[in-house]
């Protein structure tokens, strides 16, 4: 039961957290006008990763898509790669990890392949949630190194426009948004990678099988084992027989992949 | 078609109040800023401010900052400029001005109202 | 607040006449982000109330004649009337859009020679 519930909060964290990154990435207001200079101006610049757009003071606002690929910032373009890769890491997560939820059931599938699968699921997630976070952070340190240098025609960095001393750029929305959907990715990640531990294949109580002696009887008992809690190791679950039959259902537990996160 | 039909002709004494009316047609009231412009008698325009209809939200020149006050009633599409403290050289033409360019919506403007202060 | 200077303050001119008057802003009215400046031309006939010509300081207004055409950048701006007709004769403002308050010009009378 607290597996489901772990797993299951995992993805639903996941699925916020990667349309926040969708959302972040697909904002304007990346960076915004910076109005501590010049709080009376009428008109009101905000920059995202594919557009830079104008609020005028009549309400008419406009945007300009950045239509040059070669002409742009290789540090826009390595944000907008992050954030990109975040994305499709996160989508493919989201995919897996449905049909790795332990409360959906298709065909036969066994508690191993939904393991893999959520552990697999949960690394797409954290790496996600990484990327994110990466692309808005070089995107704010950008931000951060640019507001110093705002000397008359400096290059903004930002789709290659002359910048007039007065146009400053400080942290948009988008970079928060971006920062949060990020975190909570990762966390969804997490939440699946330990979920993942608890659907790793426990050893099964074995069936009482009687093995008949050529000269007298004697009757193995099945070992009974503690109970356990789905984490760690089940190597130390002693069995109390010492016969060398082995029944068709026991297996030889040795420590899986998924028992170290 | 978009018009801006202001009050009447006012006159009025000094330290006194004014309270000019600019009722808007034939376009969405509550999407445009309503600004307000003033002429003195031979003298240039100036800009005394300006109200979103929609919010309220109102920018006034800091000339005119506590002594002007605008309002608007979204029932009647109208917009209301009031002046105290009124002195002789407030005696001007005020305009109300619909402003939306950059699209094509072009500018309006009322046709003006003569408030004159004289004691 | 920006101060606009216009000149001259009068001009005397005949129809058919290539006119031009200047607009100086105290700052910049030009705008980084998309590189327009924010400043508009306005035409006032005796009586009326103003009608705006050119916005962003070259883009004429839906419905205005060819003939007139703004230029400039930064602080300097020109309004130009290539051939003068008797109803250009009128008084023009400029007017900083760029940041409040909205300031405007004291005006260019033109008038007939």
């Known amino acids: 039961m607290a597996v489901t519930a772990c797993q299951g909060l995992g993805f639903v964290v996941s699925l916020i957290g990667i349309a926040g990154i969708i959302a972040a990435t697909c904002m304007d207001q990346w960076s915004t006008q910076d109005l501590y200079n010049n709080p009376v101006t009428a008109v009101f610049n905000y920059q995202g990763l594919w557009r830079s757009c104008v609020r005028e003071s009549s309400g008419f606002t406009e945007c300009r898509g950045y239509f040059t690929l070669l002409g742009l910032p290789a540090m826009l373009q390595a944000v907008r790669a992050l954030m990109i890769v975040g994305i499709v890491l996160g989508a493919i997560g989201l995919l897996v990890s449905i049909f790795a939820l332990k409360c959906i059931r298709i065909g036969s599938m066994e508690d191993s392949a939904k393991a893999n699968m959520t552990l697999t699921s949960g690394i797409m997630f954290i790496v996600s949630g990484l990327c994110a976070i990466a692309g808005v952070s070089v995107f704010a340190n950008m931000l951060v190194t640019n507001f110093w240098m705002s000397t008359a025609n400096m290059y903004t960095g930002m789709g290659g426009m002359v910048q007039t001393v007065q146009t400053r750029y400080t942290f948009g929305a988008a970079l928060f948004v971006g920062w949060v959907a990020g975190g909570l990715t990762l966390i969804g990640g997490v939440m699946m990678c330990i979920a993942c531990r608890g659907l790793a294949p426990e050893e099964t109580n074995y069936k009482a099988v009687s093995y008949h002696a050529s000269g007298h009887s004697v009757a193995y008992k099945p070992g009974g084992f503690k109970a356990s809690t789905g984490f760690g190791s089940n190597t130390k679950n002693k069995k109390i027989y010492d016969g060398g039959a082995r029944t068709e259902d026991e297996v030889q537990s040795y420590p899986s992949k998924h028992d170290y996160v | 078609q978009v018009q801006l039909v202001q009050s009447g002709a006012e006159v009025k004494k000094p330290g006194a109040s004014v309270k000019v009316s600019c009722k808007a047609s034939?376009?969405?009231?509550?999407?445009?800023?309503m600004h307000w412009v003033r002429q003195a008698p031979g003298q240039g325009l100036e800009w005394m401010g300006m109200?979103?209809?929609?919010?309220?939200?109102?920018n006034y020149a800091q000339k005119f900052q506590g002594r002007v006050t605008m309002t608007r009633d979204t029932s009647t599409s109208t917009v209301y400029m009031e002046l105290s403290s009124l002195r002789s050289e407030d005696t001007a033409v005020y305009y109300c001005?619909?402003?939306?360019?950059?699209?094509?919506?072009?500018?309006?403007w009322g046709q003006g109202t003569t408030v004159t202060v004289s004691s | 607040d920006i101060q606009m200077t216009q000149s001259p303050s009068s001009l005397s001119a005949s129809v058919g006449d290539r006119v031009t008057m200047t607009c100086k802003s105290s700052q910049s009215l030009l705008n980084s982000g998309n590189q327009k400046n924010y400043l508009t031309w306005y035409q006032q006939k005796p009586g009326k109330a103003p009608k705006l010509l050119i916005y962003?300081?070259?883009t004429r207004e839906s419905g205005v004649p060819s003939r007139f055409s703004g230029s400039g950048s930064g602080t300097d701006f020109t309004l130009t009337i290539s051939s003068l007709q008797p109803e250009d004769f009128a008084t023009y403002y400029c007017?900083?859009?760029?940041?409040?308050?909205?300031?405007f010009g004291g005006g260019t009378k033109l008038e007939i020679k």
């Open positions: 034939g376009y969405t009231f509550t999407s445009y800023w």
């Open positions: 109200i979103h209809p929609n919010s309220g939200s109102t």
């Open positions: 007017q900083n859009d760029y940041s409040y308050p909205f300031t």
């Open positions: 962003w300081a070259s």
């Open positions: 001005a619909r402003r939306y360019y950059g699209s094509i919506s072009p500018d309006y």
